[in-house]
Amino acid sequence: GTINVHDVETQFNQYKTEAASRYNLTISDVSVSDVPFPFSAQSGA
């Protein structure tokens, strides 16, 4: 199946809030775009 980045982000933000309130943990951010350049990418959208 496919993974929707926005769904993951929404879920992550929920967990981030929960971590802060329940466990006094601070999660700054997770970058979904910090990836190496895809030299193996193929043509097509």
Partner: antibody
């Protein structure tokens, strides 16, 4: 609306240094790779550097490697290009296009600024 | 380094005519991008990954090709299409741009 505004260009002597900045707005800066591309007067475009969205992955051609350093500040949204040991052949208009790629796709440099002129001359 | 050669260097055509621009690579690449640069302006992405129209680009532009030979076609030239066109490969580093094709009014 996506906007990219380059600044910091000017006249510098050979061997000198210059730092270019690129102010980005209208999109989530940290989600996109960014690049610098230059164009000498009357010449073709030349790729200078690329940095990933989070700043971990950085690429340069041999022509600038060891002299130029790309960096970004995702909290304030600027992209930088530190240029040292400048040569006459570095004279060009420098652009900072947004780089739209991901783990397995490359959609090209989809937005460009107006450019800033760097002149290296004694 | 992969060198991209564009031909012809200059294409002299009239509005309404069809333009065919080619980009040849010294070795095989997976895909290319095409950019347009009007006089005194910044480049603009036209086509990405060989054949996909970038946002806001009219359907008269199309791209095709594979391996080491790629083509940009403008089905019917409009006055604003007279510009310089560059291809770009990013299959291997360093990323390189083509020599450019200038489309001028005949």
């Amino acid at each position: 609306e996506v906007q990219l505004v380059e600044s910091g260009g000017g006249l510098v002597k050979p061997g000198g240094s210059l730092r270019l900045s690129c102010a980005a707005s209208g999109f989530t800066f940290s989600r996109y790779g960014m690049s610098w591309v230059r164009q000498a007067p009357g010449k073709r475009l030349e790729w200078v550097s690329t940095i990933s969205g989070g700043g971990t992955y950085i690429y340069y051609p041999d022509s600038v490697k060891g002299r130029f350093t790309i960096s970004r500040d995702n909290a304030k949204n600027p992209l930088y290009l530190q240029m040292n040991s400048l040569r006459a052949e570095d004279t060009a208009v420098y652009y900072c296009p947004r780089d739209n790629y991901g783990r397995n796709y490359d959609y090209g440099m989809d937005y460009w600024g107006q450019g800033t002129l760097v002149t290296v001359s004694s | 380094e992969i060198v991209l050669t564009q031909s012809p260097a200059t294409l002299s055509l009239s509005p309404g005519e069809r333009a065919t621009l080619t980009c040849s690579a010294t070795s095989s690449v997976s895909y290319i991008h095409w950019y347009q640069q009007r006089p005194g302006q910044s480049p603009r992405l036209l086509i990405y990954s060989t054949s996909n129209l970038a946002s806001g680009i009219p359907a008269r532009f199309s791209g095709s090709g594979s391996g080491s030979d790629y083509t940009l076609t403008i089905s019917s030239l409009e006055p604003e299409d007279f510009a310089v066109y560059y291809c770009q490969q990013r299959s291997s580093s360093p990323f390189t741009f083509g020599s450019g094709t200038k489309v001028e009014i005949k």
